[in-house]
Amino acid sequence: PRSIDVKYIGVKSAYVSYDVQKRTIYLNITNTLNITNNNYYSVEVENITAQVQFAKTVIGKARLNNITHIGPLDMKQIDYTVPTVIAEEMSYMYDFCTLISIKVHNIVLMMQVTVTTTYFGHSEQISQERYQYVDCGRNTTYQLGQSEYLNVLQPQQ
């Protein structure tokens, strides 16, 4: 079998809301993946599991099941949304994200995604990690790749 390539493209949109009383930030982050099937047979994208970390703390998780199949030598672009919550010991971020004196409230989030594909009863998992800048101060739609991302060679110490 040839490879199945997974490429994390970046954040497509981030929609923000706040709970003033709880000093909590809710960020719905939609990400885009490109999955390429380099085989001469179809493969199933069985599931996508994703999580988002802020300051080494997991702030959101998502799982998509029975997503799609990808034909021979084909590529599909898949969007997935991870609902995240920044609260409790990180409630100081409420002050940052709602500061009116600054225009862009960029925070750095670690995006982790694992894609499980199957073909002829064989299962394969491919994982990706990226740091992304996301604006926690307003609803933002990004052009693909616009929200700066970089390969992660090592996790934060």
């Epitope: 000093r23 409790e88 010991e89 409630s91 100081y92 971020m93 002050d95 940052f96 960029n106 925070i107 750095v108 740091y131 800048y133 970089l150 934060q156 110490q157």
Partner: antibody
Framework: QVQLQQSGAELVKPGASVKMSCKAS????????IEWMKQNHGKSLEWIGN????????KYNEKFKGKATLTVEKSSSTVYLELSRLTSDDSAVYYC??????????WGQGTSVTVSS | DIQMTQSPASLSVSVGETVTITCRAS??????LGWYHQKQGKSPQLLVF???NLADGVPSRFSGSGSGTQYSLKINSLQSEDFGTYYC?????????FGGGTKLEIK
């Protein structure tokens, strides 16, 4: 307004311990971590460690493990830094500061520690 | 530990001049950087947080820029109260570390 009030200067003997305080006011104490720094005379700053009153999470710079201990008294919104087995190398000004995303936004006035026999 | 290399170590300038201080991190710190000003015998004061954002009450002649491993603080039209020592500090992963400082003196 936000204030961090530190305890007064200390003159201590080598081998002894010293405990200094940082009293926070003007904000919800449990929301922000408190950071501690050391500054030798005319030198740069060194991060000692931090304490988060929300969950009592404490982090130390490896260099200060066994030397520094951070504790809290939540009823008075006060964080304490205790330094043990003092030597002349511990003579410095010690600052507490409030953590904010991407910077420490409020600082105490500093506590001067002099170790001398 | 992430090392912060600040330059220049000292600078002699006149009132009204423009000054740029730079800070290089030994690895990507993703804009998690603060700039501070300290006068002799006083506590440091936050000028810029998260690399580019001016702290409350800081005059607009100060500005922070940079990303990745390279950051700078620019002071336009230097005033007499701006003299003292400037420090950068990363807040990416513990231990937070400071640059060695830049001492700004009146020419």
């Amino acid at each position: 307004q936000v204030q961090l009030q530190q305890s007064g200067a200390e003159l201590v003997k080598p081998g002894a311990s010293v405990k200094m305080s940082c009293k926070a006011s003007g904000y919800t104490f449990t929301t922000f971590p408190i950071e501690w720094m050391k500054q030798n005379h005319g030198k740069s700053l060194e991060w000692i460690g931090n304490f988060h009153p929300y969950n009592d999470d404490t982090k130390y710079n490896e260099k200060f493990k066994g030397k520094a201990t951070l504790t809290v008294e939540k009823s008075s919104s006060t964080v304490y830094l205790e330094l043990s087995r003092l030597t002349s190398d511990d003579s410095a000004v010690y600052y507490c500061a409030r953590y904010f995303y991407g910077g420490m936004d409020y600082w105490g006035q500093g506590t001067s520690v002099t170790v001398s026999s | 530990d992430i090392q912060m290399t600040q330059s220049p170590a000292s600078l002699s300038v006149s009132v009204g001049e423009t000054v740029t201080i730079t800070c290089r991190a030994s690895e990507n710190i993703y804009s998690s950087l603060g700039w501070y000003h300290q006068k002799q015998g006083k506590s440091p004061q936050l000028l810029v947080f998260a690399a580019t954002n001016l702290a409350d009450g800081v005059p607009s002649r100060f500005s922070g820029s940079g990303s990745g491993t390279q950051y700078s603080l620019k002071i336009n039209s230097l005033q007499s109260e701006d003299f003292g020592t400037y420090y950068c500090q990363h807040l990416w992963s513990v231990p937070w570390t400071f640059g060695g400082g830049t001492k700004l003196e009146i020419k």
